[in-house]
C-alpha cells in the first residue's frame, strides 16, 4: 500500500553543510576563551539577542548574529585561585558562567554569574534607545549573587525579574544542596522556600519561571516555577523523578510568627506526560527539560508546552505535552497531598481546610486579607505542612502531542510559533535536541481540535559538531530562530519554503503553515494575500485537490529526469533515485523495450532495493528497458526519474574498450549517437572500473580520472565534464557520508 507515507520521519533532513550551502543558517562559533552560550534574553524592540556565556555577555543583532558586541566579565585571579584550591576545575568551574540575564528597567539589564563558585551580580547599561548603541558593564556596582545564581555552573537556574524583584529557583550554597525559590532585590527582606523540608523541594532542577495573571486584579498575580525533582518517599516506589509546576503569589511577604520570610502561598503539583500502555502501565516521560508558554489572546490562560524525556537509561524517549492553565488551577484548587508519617502513603487531605484557602493570594478578590503576614496561624501551619497537591496535572487530550522513541537523540528545548494558514491557525514547534538538531513540527487537528496529528516537517543540523541545544528564542518580528549551545549560537529562518521543491504538489505535500504555492513558487504565505492565487492545505496536505489544475504544467518539475545508462552483461548496475522528501515511498516500474505495458518491479535475488535506489545484479539482456522511479506521498504519485538501461553483451566489450574515443567502429558509433561528450567520458570511466586489470582500488581509479580531468580542463577551458564529480561523490559515500540525491544532475551511479 503506497497511500501511507512515513509520518514519523522528517519530510526534509538537512545536514549542517546543506544548511550552510543554502544560506539557511548563520553561526557564531564562539570565542576561544569562552563557551556555554546558554542564557538568552530576546529584546525585539532593540532588535538584540543578549547571551550570557562563560566570562562574557554578548549582544547580537537579530538580523544577523555575525554582528555583535561583547562584554568581558571574568573573575579576579584571587577568586579563581580560591576556587582552584577548593578542588574545582579551573576551566569548567573556576570562571564566571552567566546564569541570569534579565531586563531590569528601560536602560539596564541585570546579570548574575557563578563567579568561580562565588556568585556575583551587576547591572548592564543598554541605553534608552537602540540607536544609543550602549552596551557596558556597571563596574562600580557589584552585588552578592547568592540566591540568584548557583555556585556550580552545572546547576540549572530559573529566574524572572518583575517590578525590580528577582525570583530565582537555584542552589544557595557552595555544595549545591540548599535548593530554594528566592525573591531578592527590591526593598523587602528576601523570601525563600522552607529549608530542610523535602516535601517543599527535593533536590530540584529548575527549568523556568513565568508570571501569569489570575484575574484582572494585579494583587492576584502568581509566579509559576517549572522544575523536576526527586519524588518524595512514599510517593513512588524506588527512586523516581517527577516534573512539577510550583506557584507563589507575587504579593507573598511571608508569615508573621511562623514561615517568617518564607513563602506562605507556595504550592506544587505534578505534571504528567505519559503514554497509556498495555496492562494499564503507562510509559512516563518525567524528566522535564524545557517549557514554553504560548500567550495568545488571553494572557491569563497561556498554553503550556513542556518537553520531557524518560528517566530510564535503557529506554530513551522524548515527548512534548501541552497543558492548559485552567487544568493547572483546577489542580491547585483540589485536594492537598497528606500523610500522617514517614511510613504512610500519601492520601488526599480529607480534613477541614483553613480559611482563606492556603495558596490563595491576599487580595480583595478572594478574601479580606491585605497581607500574608495577617494570615491566621492555622493557615500558615497548614501551608507549611501541605505544600503539594494530591492530583497531578494531566496534559490536554491526556497524551503527548509529539513522541520520539526510536531515535539516537533526546529533546532539550522548545519554542512555538502560532501561524495563520489558509485553513486556520497552527502551532509550529521548533524542538532542540541533544545532538544539535532542530526539529520543526506542526500539530494538525484531525477530526477535532483536540485530536492532533504531529507532522515532522524538517530536521535541521545547526551546529558543525553534535552538541546539545541548551537555549532557544524565537523572534516573530524577524521570523528567525536563535539557538544556543556550549559551542556557540546559531540563527535560522523559521521557514525555507523554496526548499520543498519547484512544484505545487511538493509545496502542498510539505504541509508547512508558513508556505503556500503562489502560482509559480512555494513561498511564504501571508493571510492578507489574495486567497484565489494561494494553494495550501495544512490539514490534509492533499495536492490532488489543490494542485489538480496545474498537473499539465511541466515547467515546475513534473516532467521526470531522463537518463540512459549502460551496463555490462553479468555485471551489476545501480539505478540511483531518492526523493527529496524522506516521507515519500519509492516504487519502481519496468517497461520492456518496444512495449507499452509497465510492470512493478518485484524484489528478488536479482534485484535489491535500497533507500538510494535499485541494484541490479548479474545483468541479462532481458533487463534492458525503461526503469521508472516513482515517489508516492499522501496519495500523490510523482515520477522522479526515467532510466533507460542498455545491457551490453560481453563479446562486444573488448572491442569497445580498445577503440579510441574517435575511432569509427560501427558499434561504438551506434552506441555513441545518443550520448553527450560528458556521458561518453563517464561511460569509458565506468567500463574501466569494471574491467581494468591493473587498478586494484577505486581510490587509484578515481585518482586517475581526476588527473585526466584536470589535464583536459587545462587543454579545453570551455569544456565542463559533466561527470568528473561522479567519482568524488562515490568516494564521499565511501567515507560514510549520508547523502541523499535531491536533483538528478549526475549520470546514475553504476557499480
Amino acid at each position: 500500500n503506497y497511500q501511507n507515507g512515513k509520518n514519523n520521519v522528517p519530510r526534509l533532513k538537512l545536514s549542517y553543510k546543506e544548511m550552510l550551502e543554502s544560506n539557511n543558517v548563520i553561526t557564531f562559533n564562539g570565542l576561544a576563551n569562552s563557551s556555554s552560550y546558554h542564557t538568552f534574553l530576546l529584546d525585539e524592540e532593540r532588535s538584540r539577542l543578549y547571551v550570557g556565556a562563560k566570562d562574557h555577555i554578548f549582544s547580537f543583532d537579530l538580523v544577523n548574529i555575525k554582528d555583535f558586541q561583547k562584554i568581558v566579565w571574568p573573575v579576579s585571579y584571587t577568586r579563581r585561585d580560591e576556587c582552584k584550591w577548593a578542588g574545582k576545575d579551573i576551566l569548567k568551574e573556576c570562571a564566571n558562567f552567566i546564569k541570569v540575564l534579565k531586563a531590569y528597567n528601560q536602560t539596564h539589564l541585570y546579570a548574575c554569574g557563578t563567579g568561580a563558585f562565588h556568585p556575583i551580580c551587576t547591572y548592564i547599561e543598554i541605553g534608552h534607545h537602540p540607536e544609543d548603541n550602549i552596551f557596558k558593564l556597571e563596574n562600580s556596582h557589584f552585588e552578592n549573587g547568592r540566591g540568584k545564581s548557583p555556585y556550580d555552573p552545572k546547576l540549572l537556574t530559573a529566574s524572572l525579574l518583575i517590578d525590580g524583584e528577582l525570583y530565582s529557583g537555584t542552589a544557595a550554597d557552595f555544595m549545591g544542596r540548599d535548593f530554594a525559590i528566592f525573591r531578592t532585590l527590591g526593598h523587602h527582606h528576601p523570601i525563600r522556600t522552607e529549608q530542610h523540608d523535602s516535601r517543599w523541594l527535593n533536590d530540584p532542577k529548575f527549568i523556568s519561571a513565568h508570571l501569569i495573571s489570575e484575574s484582572d486584579n494585579p494583587e492576584d498575580d502568581k509566579v509559576y516555577f517549572f522544575f523536576r525533582e526527586n519524588a518524595i518517599d512514599g510517593e513512588h516506589s524506588g527512586k523516581a523523578t517527577h516534573a512539577r509546576i510550583g506557584q507563589i503569589c507575587k504579593n507573598d511577604f511571608g508569615g508573621h510568627r511562623s514561615l517568617v520570610n518564607k513563602w506562605t502561598t507556595f504550592l506544587k503539583a505534578r505534571l504528567i506526560c505519559s503514554v497509556p500502555g498495555p496492562n494499564g502501565i503507562d510509559t512516563h516521560f518525567d524528566e522535564l527539560q524545557d517549557v514554553f508558554l504560548m500567550n495568545f489572546k488571553d494572557p491569563k490562560n497561556p498554553v503550556v508546552y513542556g518537553v520531557f524525556t524518560t528517566s530510564s537509561n535503557i529506554f530513551k524517549g522524548s515527548a512534548v505535552c501541552m497543558y492548559s492553565m485552567s487544568d493547572v488551577r483546577r489542580v491547585f484548587l483540589g485536594p492537598y497531598a497528606h500523610r500522617d508519617g514517614p511510613n504512610y502513603q500519601w492520601v488526599p487531605y480529607q480534613g477541614r481546610v483553613p480559611y482563606p484557602r492556603p495558596g490563595t493570594c491576599p487580595s480583595k478578590t478572594f478574601g479580606g486579607f491585605d497581607s500574608t503576614k495577617d494570615l491566621p496561624d492555622d493557615v500558615i501551619t497548614f501551608a507549611r505542612s501541605h505544600p503539594a497537591m494530591y492530583n497531578p496535572v494531566f496534559p490536554m487530550n491526556n497524551r503527548p502531542i509529539v513522541i520520539k522513541t526510536d531515535v539516537n537523540y533526546q529533546f532539550t528545548q522548545i519554542v512555538v510559533d502560532r501561524v495563520d494558514a489558509e485553513d486556520g491557525q497552527y502551532d509550529v514547534m521548533f524542538i532542540g535536541t541533544d545532538v544539535g538538531t532542530v526539529l520543526k513540527v506542526v500539530s494538525i487537528p484531525k477530526e477535532t481540535w483536540y485530536d492532533l496529528e504531529e507532522v515532522l516537517l524538517e530536521e535541521m543540523t545547526v551546529f558543525r559538531e553534535p552538541t546539545a541545544i541548551s537555549a532557544m528564542e524565537l523572534s516573530t518580528k524577524q521570523q528567525q530562530l536563535y539557538i544556543g549551545s556550549t559551542a556557540g549560537v546559531a540563527q535560522l529562518p523559521l521557514h525555507r519554503c523554496d526548499i520543498y521543491g519547484k512544484a505545487c504538489a511538493e509545496c502542498c505535500l510539505a504541509r508547512d503553515p508558513y508556505c503556500a504555492w503562489d502560482g509559480s513558487a512555494c513561498s511564504r504565505y501571508f493571510p492578507t494575500a489574495k486567497r484565489r492565487t494561494r494553494r495550501q492545505d495544512i490539514r490534509n496536505g492533499d495536492p490532488l485537490t489543490h494542485c489538480s489544475d496545474l498537473h499539465h504544467d511541466n515547467h515546475h518539475g513534473h516532467s521526470p529526469e531522463e537518463r540512459i545508462i549502460y551496463g555490462v552483461e553479468n555485471s551489476s548496475t545501480f539505478l540511483e533515485c531518492s526523493p527529496k522528501s524522506q516521507r515519500a515511498l519509492v516504487y519502481w516500474q519496468f517497461q520492456r523495450r518496444n512495449e507499452e505495458r509497465k510492470e512493478e518491479i518485484r524484489v528478488d535475488d536479482h534485484i535489491i532495493r535500497t533507500d538510494q535506489g535499485l541494484l541490479l545484479r548479474s545483468l541479462q539482456q532481458k533487463d534492458s528497458g525503461n526503469y521508472l522511479c516513482h515517489a508516492v506521498e499522501h496519495g500523490f504519485i510523482q515520477t522522479l526519474l526515467k532510466v533507460t538501461l542498455e545491457v551490453i553483451d560481453t563479446e562486444h566489450l573488448e572491442e569497445l574498450l580498445h577503440k579510441d574515443d574517435d575511432g569509427d567502429g560501427s558499434k561504438t558509433k551506434e552506441m555513441s549517437n545518443s550520448m553527450t561528450p560528458s556521458q561518453k567520458v563517464w561511460y569509458r570511466d565506468f567500463m574501466q572500473l569494471i574491467n581494468h586489470p591493473n587498478l586494484n582500488t577505486m581510490d587509484e581509479f578515481c585518482e586517475q580520472v581526476w588527473k585526466r580531468d584536470r589535464k583536459q580542463r587545462r587543454q579545453r577551458p570551455g569544456h565542463t565534464p559533466g561527470n568528473s564529480n561522479k567519482w568524488k561523490h562515490l568516494q564521499e559515500n565511501k567515507k560514510g557520508r549520508n547523502r541523499r540525491t535531491h536533483e538528478f544532475e549526475r549520470a546514475p551511479r553504476s557499480v
Partner: antibody, heavy 123, light 111 residues
Framework: EVQLLESGGGLVQPGGSLRLSCAAS????????MNWVRQAPGKGLEWVSG????????DYADSVKGRFTISRDNSKNTLYLQMNSLRAEDTAVYYC????????????????WGQGTLVTVSS | QSVLTQPPSVSGAPGQRVTISCTGS?????????VHWYQQLPGTAPKLLIY???NRPSGVPDRFSGSKSGTSASLAITGLQAEDEADYYC???????????FGGGTKLTVL
C-alpha cells in the same frame, strides 16, 4: 520571653547512655529548627546536631554520627538528645539552641541558648 | 583544630577599640555565607551578638559592629568596657558536613 531549659546531664561511664531534654517556652516551638551545641571544658563551641520543625531534616556532626539521636515532641515543646556509646571526649556542657535564621541569606544562627547541662564521661 | 581561625586572645584598655578577626575558606565565609558572632561571659551560655555579618539584635549596644570581606570577617568593639571581658566566637554556615562551623574563640581581656 524565650526560655530554653536543659536537663538530663550527669556522670556516666564510657560506653554508657544518657538522654538530654530541653524544655522550650515563650515561642512557637513547632515553628523553629532546634540544635544541640556542646563545649568541652576550657574549649570552644562545637555544633552537635540539628532538627527541623517537623523532624523532616536531621543532621549530626561526624564525631557523634551513629551514636547520638536527636528528636523532638512538638506537643510537649521538648527537644531531646539520646546519647549512646559515650566516650571520654564527649565530656562537655551541652546547650540547646534555637536557629534564628535572622540574616538575609537564611544562614543558621543561634538566637537563643539554654544555660546548658554538664555531661561527664569517666570511669 | 577549628575550621574558622580566631586569635586566641586580644586585650585593650577601657575606652579603646579592639578588633577580633575570623578567617575561613572559600567553602564557608568565602562562599558568601553570613558570619555571626557570639559573646560568652564567664560561666554563662553564649549570646548572639552580631548576625548576618553586621546586624545587631535588639539590646546589643552599638559599640559592637561586624564586617566581612572575602574569606574573613571581623568584630570591632569601640569604647571598651570592663563588662566586655568575655570569650567571643564567630560562626558560619558550612553546608551539609558539618552544618555549621565555629571559630576557636578569642578571649578578650580589658586591662
Amino acid at each position: 520571653e524565650v526560655q530554653l531549659l536543659e536537663s538530663g546531664g550527669g556522670l556516666v561511664q564510657p560506653g554508657g547512655s544518657l538522654r538530654l531534654s530541653c524544655a522550650a517556652s515563650g515561642f512557637d516551638f513547632d515553628s523553629y529548627e532546634m540544635n544541640w551545641v556542646r563545649q568541652a571544658p576550657g574549649k570552644g563551641l562545637e555544633w552537635v546536631s540539628g532538627i527541623s520543625w517537623n523532624s523532616g531534616w536531621i543532621d549530626y556532626a561526624d564525631s557523634v554520627k551513629g551514636r547520638f539521636t536527636i528528636s523532638r515532641d512538638n506537643s510537649k515543646n521538648t527537644l531531646y538528645l539520646q546519647m549512646n556509646s559515650l566516650r571520654a571526649e564527649d565530656t562537655a556542657v551541652y546547650y540547646c539552641a534555637r536557629s534564628g535564621y535572622s540574616s538575609s541569606w537564611f544562614d543558621p544562627d543561634f538566637d537563643y541558648w539554654g544555660q546548658g547541662t554538664l555531661v561527664t564521661v569517666s570511669s | 583544630q577549628s575550621v574558622l581561625t580566631q586569635p586566641p586572645s586580644v586585650s585593650g584598655a577601657p575606652g579603646q577599640r579592639v578588633t577580633i578577626s575570623c578567617t575561613g575558606s572559600s567553602s564557608n565565609i568565602g562562599a558568601g555565607y553570613d558570619v555571626h558572632w557570639y559573646q560568652q561571659l564567664p560561666g554563662t551560655a553564649p549570646k548572639l551578638l552580631i548576625y548576618g555579618n553586621s546586624n545587631r539584635p535588639s539590646g546589643v549596644p552599638d559599640r559592637f559592629s561586624g564586617s566581612k570581606s572575602g574569606t574573613s570577617a571581623s568584630l570591632a568593639i569601640t569604647g571598651l568596657q570592663a563588662e566586655d571581658e568575655a570569650d567571643y566566637y564567630c560562626q558560619s554556615y558550612a553546608g551539609p558536613n558539618p552544618y555549621v562551623v565555629f571559630g576557636g574563640g578569642t578571649k578578650l581581656t580589658v586591662l
